[in-house]
Amino acid sequence: IPTEIPTSALVKETLALLSTHRTLLIANETLRIPVPVHKNHQLCTEEIFQGIGTLESQTVQGGTVERLFKNLSLIKKYIDGQKKKCGEERRRVNQFLDYLQEFLGVMNTEWIIES
Amino acid sequence: IPTEIPTSALVKETLALLSTHRTLLIANETLRIPVPVHKNHQLCTEEIFQGIGTLESQTVQGGTVERLFKNLSLIKKYIDGQKKKCGEERRRVNQFLDYLQEFLGVMNTEWIIES
């Protein structure tokens, strides 16, 4: 990811910029953007970044608001890179089963599951 | 999700079945399946279930191993439903920003981020 700062620092800075520019961003009161119904955020990265694209096109650019959208673009690049890493390594069945067990374990303990 | 038991119970049962049938499942020592490199599992659901499909096609069916793959199929249906819910509600910008802030907050605190 082509950025001088680590992704974790980038996320922190983006949170601060989002807070700073909130008033400017909500100026368009008629615009509609998809908001996921649940809190399993990682399942919705595509829609989240589509929403960011819509918001960017409707926001007057300049100053640090540009920095906010640049950061969000870098975060998208990082996530796209992570998605590529889902299928790059083909390994033995026992290693796949370890990962599947871990996935189901996380789903069991951390996901917000509605019946 | 068309199942008589809640998804949370389904996940628990699947974990138990996975443990029970592990020896049978790893019998094919030549089979190679994509295993994600990182622990942000939700980003990799597509690859995980493709891997399950590959494994199922290579496994002799019958008894409770069939139940395992049926459960995994129901879990996939649940996740597909959750993915649909990412874009069904198109709301005002302020509600989108709340979700974006929450997403970045979770990314900041819970994701396993490599620089």
Epitope: R32, P34 | E88, R92
Partner: antibody
């Protein structure tokens, strides 16, 4: 199957309020939003407002000051209340489920405002 | 508010004919983020609520016959019925699903010749 059933009065006195209940089946109000739309010969179809799956609301600015939408998800009921009705509020009032757009509609409640 | 203008206001047709009705919006209904046109079409028969036919300008709702086709982008949209059946006689409404408030056209009434 998905159904929305409406109940409410047919006749309302001028300056009084209108209350309609929309009872849904075949889906959960924690997963889907519900819109309210009215239809009159003079003004055609008019969108009034929506209550989202999470409980937040959005209203048409024209009706905001006298409209309230709430719900009891455990009873699968959505409540619509409009204050200070005048003769030009005579219309058929509909509730409709949100899934991207308004995919299922109630049968409608015909409301006449007259003394 | 986005104004939706439908034309014609009524159409007289014979069974089996191809029918085209138009809907024009006062602002573009194309969203840059998802590159989708947020427009829906509904059919309403007398004494019934509207029924969803098309959303996203061209996506047919499940169970809707394939003789109904939605097309268009930006501000100009079309609903085509390739071979009109007797049960298609109704009023057809387009709806802006792009921005709040959601707004509807005045309708196109499909009548039998």
């Amino acid at each position: 199957q998905v159904q929305l059933r409406q109940s409410g009065p047919g006749l309302v006195q001028p300056s009084q309020s209108l209350s309609i209940t929309c009872t849904v089946s075949g889906f959960s109000l924690t997963s889907y939003g519900v819109h309210w739309v009215r239809q009159s010969p003079g003004k055609g179809l008019e969108w009034l407002g929506v209550i989202w799956s999470g409980g937040s609301t959005d209203y048409n600015a024209v009706f905001m000051s006298r409209l309230s939408i709430s719900k009891d998800s455990s009873k699968s009921q959505v409540f619509f209340k409009m204050n200070s009705l005048q003769t030009d509020d005579t219309a058929i009032y509909y509730c409709a489920r949100n899934r991207y757009v308004l995919d299922y509609w109630g049968q409608g409640t015909s409301v006449t405002v007259s003394s | 508010d986005i104004v939706m203008t439908q034309s014609p206001s009524s159409l007289s047709v014979s069974a089996g004919e191809r029918v085209t009705m138009r809907c024009k919006s006062s602002q573009s209904l194309l969203t840059s983020g998802d590159q989708k046109n947020h427009l829906a079409w509904y059919q309403q028969k007398p004494g019934q609520p509207p029924k969803l036919l098309i959303y996203g300008a061209s996506t047919r709702e499940s169970g809707v016959p394939d003789r109904f086709t939605g097309s268009g982008s930006g501000t100009d949209f079309t609903l085509t019925i390739t071979s009109v059946q007797a049960e298609d006689l109704a009023v057809y409404y387009c709806q802006n699903d792009h921005s709040f408030p959601l707004t509807f056209g005045a309708g196109t009434k499909l009548e039998l010749k």
